[in-house]
Interface confidence: medium
């Protein structure tokens, strides 16, 4: 399976208190079960919606409602494939103080996608 984080550069800088949406694209697998990892630990969240682009191309989301300092770190997504864990390239999430200008790359996902989420 080919995994990649979409719509995000290697370094993602956001203002404290702002929402962040990370997209993970999985190709070459049917019905992948995507897990998100932060700094080496699985993010203990119920999964986000998966968008089936095609039978073997899926996109999953990780959404943070209101980013705080504790959310800063290195994120990646992973899937189990044939008993092995495959991981994506990571993205570094860094914060700037509330009100500072930041590059909101997390808005790059397609605006028509409405996805369930419970994190601000």
């Amino acid at each position: 399976a080919g995994l990649k984080l979409m719509g995000a550069p290697v370094k993602l800088t956001v203002s404290q208190g702002q929402p962040v949406k990370l997209n993970c694209s999985v190709e070459g697998m049917e019905e992948p079960d995507i897990q998100w990892v932060k700094d080496g630990a699985v993010v203990q969240n119920l999964d986000q919606l998966y968008i089936p682009v095609s039978e073997q191309h899926w996109i999953g989301f990780l959404s943070l409602k209101s980013v705080e300092r504790s959310d800063a770190g290195r994120y990646w997504c992973q899937v189990e494939d044939g008993g092995e864990t495959e991981i994506s390239q990571p993205v570094w999430l860094t914060l700037v103080p509330r009100g500072s200008s930041a590059h909101h790359h997390h808005h790059h996902h397609h605006s028509a996608w409405s996805h369930p989420q419970f994190e601000k």
Partner: antibody, heavy 116, light 108 residues
Framework: EVQLVQSGADVKKPGASLTISCQAS????????ISWVRQKPGKGLEWMGS????????HYGPSFQGHVTISADRSTATAYLQWRSLEASDTAMYYC?????????WGPGTLVTVSS | SYELTQPPSVSVSPGQTARITCSGD??????AYWYQQKSGQAPVLVIY???KRSSGIPERFSGSSSGTMATLTISGAQVEDEADYYC???????????FGGGTKLTVL
């Protein structure tokens, strides 16, 4: 049309085992999670737990962990809620629901009565 | 375990504004969802992600969230809005979901 068809009402004695089912139709079963919600007579809604769209993982509410088991059979698009040993306090209406946050499609509910 | 706290009941006259609150320690970080349940029926999603109205829900229903409090507002409540309303959100860790205790809205 998206539909969730639940098994019929059941009456059991305390200590008995029980499995109720929820068959999905009108959509691709593996595209969505399935959640179970309990509602005791005259009381509020309680989230019991959910099973992932690939049926590989389950999440349970603290009150239900260890008391019920959620499973699914992808080949028949059916989700299950199972008890090994029922208690009188399990008397309730049990809804299966498509999703886990956006609970848009609800089954009609299965009434489970546990009485000696 | 995590709890969401709602008032047991709210009463308004037809045409008045009804506000139903939901309090929870994780709400600054977690989205709130609101469900309406009329007598003898399955619940219906009214508001998702704090403030987005579900399809088919009248414009008089709106939602907001600030700090540890989420609020469902019904501007110009109608008799047909009489129902039980439940907030729904995730715990702090995000590994399970919780319903509030429910609020019975009476419009008379």
């Amino acid at each position: 049309e998206v539909q969730l068809v639940q098994s019929g009402a059941d009456v059991k004695k305390p200590g008995a085992s029980l499995t109720i089912s929820c068959q999905a139709s009108g959509y691709t079963f593996t595209d969505y999670w399935i959640s179970w919600v309990r509602q005791k007579p005259g009381k509020g809604l309680e989230w019991m737990g959910s099973i992932t769209r690939s049926s590989s993982r389950t999440h349970y509410g603290p009150s239900f962990q260890g008391h019920v088991t959620i499973s699914a059979d992808r080949s028949t698009a059916t989700a299950y809620l199972q008890w090994r040993s029922l208690e009188a306090s399990d008397t309730a209406m049990y809804y299966c629901v498509r999703g886990y946050t956006h609970l848009r499609t609800w089954g009609p509910g299965t009434l489970v009565t546990v009485s000696s | 375990s995590y709890e969401l706290t709602q008032p047991p009941s709210v009463s308004v006259s037809p045409g008045q504004t009804a506000r139903i609150t939901c309090s929870g320690d994780a709400l600054p970080k977690k989205y709130a969802y609101w469900y309406q349940q009329k007598s003898g029926q399955a619940p219906v999603l009214v508001i998702y992600e704090d403030s987005k109205r579900s399809s088919g829900i009248p414009e008089r229903f709106s939602g907001s969230s600030s700090g540890t409090m989420a609020t469902l507002t019904i501007s110009g409540a109608q008799v047909e809005d009489e129902a039980d309303y439940y907030c729904y959100s995730a715990n702090q860790r995000g590994n399970y979901m919780v319903f509030g205790g429910g609020t019975k809205l009476t419009v008379l």
